[in-house]
């Protein structure tokens, strides 16, 4: 008799794929035709592009009125006219819903100011946030984000209260908190009192970019958080290029999309947008490079392969890899909610298996080092339910030159510098 199927876990929409942060709507909008409309309307115009990335939610803003460091002139219920109108926002919500993209609103109060939470007027601000949650939930948003919560006194209790409001409205609404902290104990204390909170932090940005260290960070985090749902990013707001050299971007994309939890990216991560390559652009919010005319300040500074348009036409680009990974992440059961087992594969490597019941299984092998390595996959570390076969089919490599679909012998696996492999193999009874 065939073994009984394992019961599928209840999955919320944010469990099914990546979130995409657009912190600065004006920078995302770019130049040229994009400037024809207010940024919120312009964003509505980009929804088909965002659909092509298969992201499940957009984290927007903040877009509310905020006069720097002035709590009285900060209105979380009003959209700053520089971004558009409430009508534009309603229209964006409707259009996003039609495309099955959720909208999460960042309500970090003093986003233009020195301290995000007006440290001296915490109670006033907390009341404003409560009112804003209720107002925007009624307006139809799917969730909220608050950042820099290390600057919020009694953050845990406020987050619990805001979570109650959000979940009280609907279990299908999400609260994301962001912190600059990379300290696991601080992160765990924030998570302890908030069951469904999604937390973005700088935890992984501390990895020192070695395989062993990354493996130990990931496994420590997963062990410490038990069976709660995680999110994966390198920071609460910044681009991957703020932390990573170009040669590791593909590796990290592969990792973030295949770890158990929700991957969270910032606009431009899909193309390797790098403020350092754009003189005069702010590090935290460089202009999005839609095409070569997107950065007119210095003619010739932007080449086609740095842009969405150029990378869309190149199957070997970072954008094409992002799209493929996002697609796999959103449709394969083992990646959607499969178990995770990390195991030894040799120095400099991080490898793990994702598997769910009798579905196709995935093996990820990541070489963080700048030398080629032979992987010694130690299957003895794995439980019987996740044993390795002798061969697995190559689904994709982060480097060009490998024949996709070809079976690779796992005992003789060689990886190029900074190469990541995603392999698949069937369940065997």
């Amino acid at each position: 008799r065939a073994p009984r199927c394992r019961e599928l876990p209840a999955q919320k929409w944010w469990h099914t794929g990546a979130l995409y942060r657009i912190g600065d709507l004006q920078a995302f909008q770019g130049h040229g035709a994009g400037n024809l409309a207010a940024p919120i309307s312009g964003l509505k115009g980009r929804l088909d592009y965002l659909s092509s990335l298969k992201v499940k939610g957009l984290v927007l803003g903040p877009i509310h009125k905020n006069q720097k460091d002035d709590v009285a002139q900060t209105d979380l219920l009003q959209i700053d006219p520089n971004f558009g109108s409430k009508e534009d926002f309603d229209s964006l919500l409707q259009s996003a819903k039609k495309k099955s993209i959720r909208v999460i609103l960042d309500l970090t109060p003093n986003y233009r100011g020195e301290n995000s939470w007006f440290s001296t007027q915490v109670d006033t601000v907390a009341t404003k946030v409560k009112d804003a949650l209720e107002f925007w939930l009624q307006a139809g948003v799917d969730g909220f984000q608050v950042r820099d919560i290390e600057n919020l006194k009694d953050a845990s209790s406020f987050l619990a209260e805001w979570q109650n409001i959000t979940k009280g409205f609907s279990e299908d609404r999400l609260l994301i908190a962001g912190t600059n902290s990379s300290d696991l104990q601080q992160i765990l204390s924030l998570l302890e009192s908030n069951k469904d909170l999604l937390l973005t932090s700088s935890y992984l940005s501390d990895s020192g970019s070695t395989g062993e260290h990354t493996k130990s960070l990931v496994t420590q985090y997963l062990n410490a958080t038990g069976n709660r749902w995680c999110s994966w990013s390198l920071s609460q707001a910044r681009l991957l290029t703020s932390f990573l050299p170009a040669q590791l971007l593909r590796l990290y994309q592969l990792m973030l999309f295949t770890l158990p939890g929700t991957p969270v990216f910032s606009y431009g991560d899909e193309i390797g947008l790098d403020a350092a390559a754009l003189p005069g652009q702010p590090m935290e919010a460089p202009v999005m490079l839609w095409d070569e005319s997107s950065f007119p300040d210095i003619p010739g500074a932007v080449s086609a392969n740095m842009t969405v348009k150029g990378q869309s036409e190149d199957p070997g680009s970072l954008l094409s890899l992002f799209r493929r990974l996002s697609d796999q992440r959103s449709k394969e059961r083992s990646l959607l909610h499969g178990d995770f087992h990390a195991f030894s594969a040799g120095p400099g490597l991080f490898s793990y298996i994702r598997h769910w019941d009798q579905n196709e299984r995935f093996l990820v092998v990541l070489n963080f080092g700048d030398v080629g390595l032979s992987a010694g996959l130690q299957a003895s570390d794995l439980p019987a339910s996740a044993s390795l076969p002798a061969k697995a089919d190559l689904l994709l490599s982060t480097q060009p030159g490998r024949e996709e679909g070809s079976p690779l012998e796992l005992e003789r696996l060689k990886l190029e510098p900074h190469e990541g492999l995603l392999l698949r193999f069937p369940y065997a009874a």
Epitope: A37, I40, D48, S85, E87, D88
Partner: antibody, heavy 126, light 108 residues
Framework: QVQLVQSGAEVKKPGASVKVSCKAS????????ISWVRQAPGQGLEWMGW????????NYAQKLQGRVTMTTDTSTTTAYMELRSLRSDDTAVYYC???????????????????WGQGTLVTVSS | DIQMTQSPSSLSASVGDRVTITCRAS??????LNWYQQKPGKAPKLLIY???SLQSGVPSRFSGSGSGTDFTLTISSLQPEDFATYYC??????????FGQGTRLEIK
């Protein structure tokens, strides 16, 4: 509901100027762009240029550069198109249209014209 | 500038007929093509955008297809109110926005 209402017909002499208005209502004026499109008698449609009601940025068709000016007045939610040094081949119906943006797979922005004014006939004749 | 060429320039058809109008771009415009209908003395009306998306309120007998350089507008079963002039418009390489020269659809 969204409406664009244009000013009435004009008869002008060659060399003169004409200014056509387009009053918008039923939506947030500053959130969209306005394009101007003209149609000579019995002919097809010709795009003249656009203006962003959000920030006043303009872009004009090459052949009209230097003769056309597009402006907006956000207080009255009205767009204007002024054409100078009129010639007989400028005789046409002039339309304003709201520009809505959309994008595709490669992120390029397309523009569609979802609402149009009723048209203003400008006749240039000596 | 991208040139848009429509064919035929005019055609005659009867109520109930299936009609196809084509539009060719002088270079690839991906799916950045819109179709408009214009009746005499009236402003154009948007029918299809992004090559195949039906504008809200437009009857489902209208459909669009194509990408790259070749596009078609199809009316599955002509109704009396469909006799008009149809224009394609590209907005891939903007500015400038360019229109086709139009196709006049008349009653046979």
């Amino acid at each position: 509901q969204v409406q664009l209402v244009q000013s009435g017909a004009e008869v002008k002499k060659p060399g003169a100027s004409v200014k056509v208005s387009c009053k918008a209502s039923g939506y947030t004026f500053t959130s969209y762009g306005i394009s101007w499109v003209r149609q000579a008698p019995g002919q097809g449609l010709e795009w003249m240029g656009w203006i962003s009601a959000y920030n006043g940025n303009t872009n004009y068709a090459q052949k009209l550069q230097g003769r056309v000016t597009m402006t907006t007045d956000t207080s009255t939610t009205t767009a204007y198109m002024e054409l100078r040094s009129l010639r007989s081949d400028d005789t046409a119906v002039y339309y304003c249209a709201r520009g809505e943006l959309y994008s595709g797979y490669d992120g390029t922005l397309g523009i569609l014209f979802d609402y149009w004014g009723q048209g203003t006939l400008v006749t240039v004749s000596s | 500038d991208i040139q848009m060429t429509q064919s035929p320039s005019s055609l005659s058809a009867s109520v109930g007929d299936r009609v196809t109008i084509t539009c060719r771009a002088s270079q690839s415009i991906s799916s950045y093509l819109n179709w408009y209908q214009q009746k005499p003395g009236k402003a154009p009306k948007l029918l299809i955008y992004a090559a195949s998306s039906l504008q809200s309120g437009v009857p489902s007998r209208f459909s669009g297809s194509g990408s790259g350089t070749d596009f078609t507008l199809t009316i599955s079963s002509l109704q009396p109110e469909d006799f008009a002039t149809y224009y394609c418009q590209q907005s891939y390489s903007t500015p400038p926005i360019t229109f086709g020269q139009g196709t006049r659809l008349e009653i046979k």
